[in-house]
Interface confidence: low
C-alpha cells in the first residue's frame, strides 16, 4: 500500500492529524523533499553572518560572512576573522608570521618556507612573511658550461673601449 504522504511535494508536509493532508510549510520553514512529515526551520543569518540566499518554502537560507570574516565548516557554519597576508589568527588575534614562515592568504596558518636544499636546489628569491621562497635550479638542471660559480662579466656599455 502506497504511503499517502509520498504525494506531498517539497514545500509542504504531510499532516498526520488531518488525514495525511499536504499542508504548506509554516512561516520561516521549508521542506526540500517530498513526503516530509514536518518542515525544517529556516536558517537565520544573524550577527556576523549575512544572507546569501533567502529561505524559500523548498530550500533553506544560505549564509556567508560579513566583510572582514570568512566562512568555515560545511555550509558556512562558522565565520572566522580575516587577517592580513603575512599573519595568522591566534587566540589573541592576528599575529605576524614567525621568521621562516609565511601566509599568502587572509585565512589559515603560517607555513614554513620551502627548504630548497631538500631537492638539491638553491634559494633564488628569499622568502618573506607573505611569500614562500623561490627555489633556483639544481646543478643537474643547468645546461653544460653554465655551472661555473664565477659570475659572468658585466656587459660593456656601448661606445666605451676597454681601458
Amino acid at each position: 500500500l502506497q504511503d499517502p504522504c509520498s504525494n506531498c511535494p517539497a514545500g509542504t508536509f504531510c499532516d498526520n492529524n488531518r488525514n495525511q493532508i499536504c499542508s504548506p510549510c509554516p512561516p520561516n520553514s521549508f521542506s526540500s523533499a517530498g513526503g516530509q512529515r514536518t518542515c525544517d526551520i529556516c536558517r537565520q543569518c544573524k550577527g556576523v553572518f549575512r544572507t546569501r540566499k533567502e529561505c524559500s518554502s523548498t530550500s533553506n537560507a544560505e549564509c556567508d560572512c560579513t566583510p572582514g570574516f570568512h566562512c568555515l565548516g560545511a555550509g558556512c557554519s562558522r565565520c572566522e576573522q580575516d587577517c592580513k597576508q603575512g599573519q595568522e589568527l591566534t587566540k589573541k588575534g592576528c599575529k605576524d608570521c614567525c621568521f621562516g614562515t609565511f601566509n599568502d592568504q587572509k585565512r589559515g596558518i603560517c607555513r614554513p618556507w620551502t627548504n630548497c636544499s631538500l631537492d638539491g636546489k638553491s634559494v633564488l628569491v628569499n622568502g618573506t612573511k607573505e611569500r614562500d621562497v623561490v627555489c633556483g635550479p639544481s646543478p643537474a638542471d643547468l645546461s653544460p658550461g653554465a655551472s661555473s660559480v664565477t659570475p659572468p662579466a658585466p656587459a660593456r656599455e656601448p661606445g666605451h673601449s676597454p681601458q
Epitope: D15, S23, R37, T38, R43
Partner: antibody, heavy 117, light 107 residues
Framework: QVQLQESGPGLVKPSETLSITCTVS????????VHWVRQPPGKGLEGLGV???????NYNSALMSRLTISKDNSKSQVSLKMSSLTAADTAMYYC???????????WGQGTTVTVSS | DIQMTQSPSSLSASLGDRVTISCSAS??????LNWYQQKPDGTVKLLIY???TLHSGVPSRFSGSGSGTDFTLTISSLQPEDVATYYC?????????FGGGTKLEIK
C-alpha cells in the same frame, strides 16, 4: 501509539549540570522535532528549545548559554543538558513532539527536577 | 521575543456554562496560535492548532477564533472533565512562547 518518556536525576545540586533524556517510541526522530518545555512549581509553561529532524537546534534566548539539546536517532532519544543550575531551575521538565505545523501533539508525562544542596 | 498574555488568570464557572478565555500577542502573529490543556495531574494535551483547527479526538465543544493579536478559546458547555489550566502558544516567531495560563474551576 506514539509515546514520549522523560527520565532525569530528580535532585541536582546548585552549579551542577542537569541531564535529562526523552525516549520516543512509535515515532521517528528523523521525521519529527522534539521540543523541551519546563514548568516551575505553581507557574506556567516555558519553552526551552527544539531539535529538528535534521539535527539543527533553536534555543530560548535567555537560556541559550546554558542549554544543549542533542539526539541519537538510532536510540530514539533526545537529551537536554543545562549547566550552572540554580534553585530557579527547579521545575517539571517535559518533552513534546513537534509535528509539521509546529504544534506539540504528543507530550511526555514530565520529570521533576529539584535543584537543592 | 513575542509576549503572550492570557486573561483571566483564573475563572470559576458552572457546569453547562459557556466559557471564553482570551489570549493576546505583543505583536501580530497571523493565525499561528495553538491551545493546550493541562490537567491537575500535570498531563498536557493539544486542543487546537492554527487558531481554530480542532486536534483529533478533542470534543467539538472546544473552539478557537481570532487573528493578528487577539485570540479566544471557547468551551460551549462546560463539563466536569474540563477542569484544567489552559495555555495559548504562538509559533509565528522563534522562540515559541506560551501565555501565562488560565486556571478553570467548577463552581
Amino acid at each position: 501509539q506514539v509515546q514520549l518518556q522523560e527520565s532525569g536525576p530528580g535532585l541536582v545540586k546548585p552549579s551542577e549540570t542537569l541531564s535529562i533524556t526523552c525516549t520516543v517510541s512509535g515515532s521517528s526522530l528523523t521525521s519529527y522535532g522534539v521540543h523541551w518545555v519546563r514548568q516551575p512549581p505553581g507557574k506556567g509553561l516555558e519553552g526551552l528549545g527544539v531539535i529538528w529532524p535534521g539535527g539543527s537546534t533553536n534555543y530560548n534566548s535567555a537560556l541559550m548559554s546554558r542549554l544543549t539539546i542533542s539526539k541519537d536517532n538510532s536510540k530514539s532519544q533526545v537529551s537536554l543538558k543545562m549547566s550552572s543550575l540554580t534553585a530557579a531551575d527547579t521545575a517539571m521538565y517535559y518533552c513534546a513532539r513537534v509535528t509539521g505545523t509546529w504544534y506539540f501533539d504528543v507530550w511526555g508525562q514530565g520529570t521533576t527536577v529539584t535543584v537543592s544542596s | 521575543d513575542i509576549q503572550m498574555t492570557q486573561s483571566p488568570s483564573s475563572l470559576s464557572a458552572s457546569l453547562g456554562d459557556r466559557v471564553t478565555i482570551s489570549c493576546s500577542a505583543s505583536q501580530g502573529i497571523s493565525n499561528y496560535l495553538n491551545w493546550y490543556q493541562q490537567k491537575p495531574d500535570g498531563t498536557v494535551k493539544l486542543l487546537i492548532y492554527y487558531t481554530s483547527t480542532l486536534h483529533s479526538g478533542v470534543p467539538s465543544r472546544f473552539s478557537g477564533s481570532g487573528s493578528g493579536t487577539d485570540f479566544t478559546l471557547t468551551i460551549s458547555s462546560l463539563q466536569p472533565e474540563d477542569v484544567a489550566t489552559y495555555y495559548c502558544q504562538q509559533y509565528s516567531k522563534l522562540p515559541w512562547t506560551f501565555g501565562g495560563g488560565t486556571k478553570l474551576e467548577i463552581k
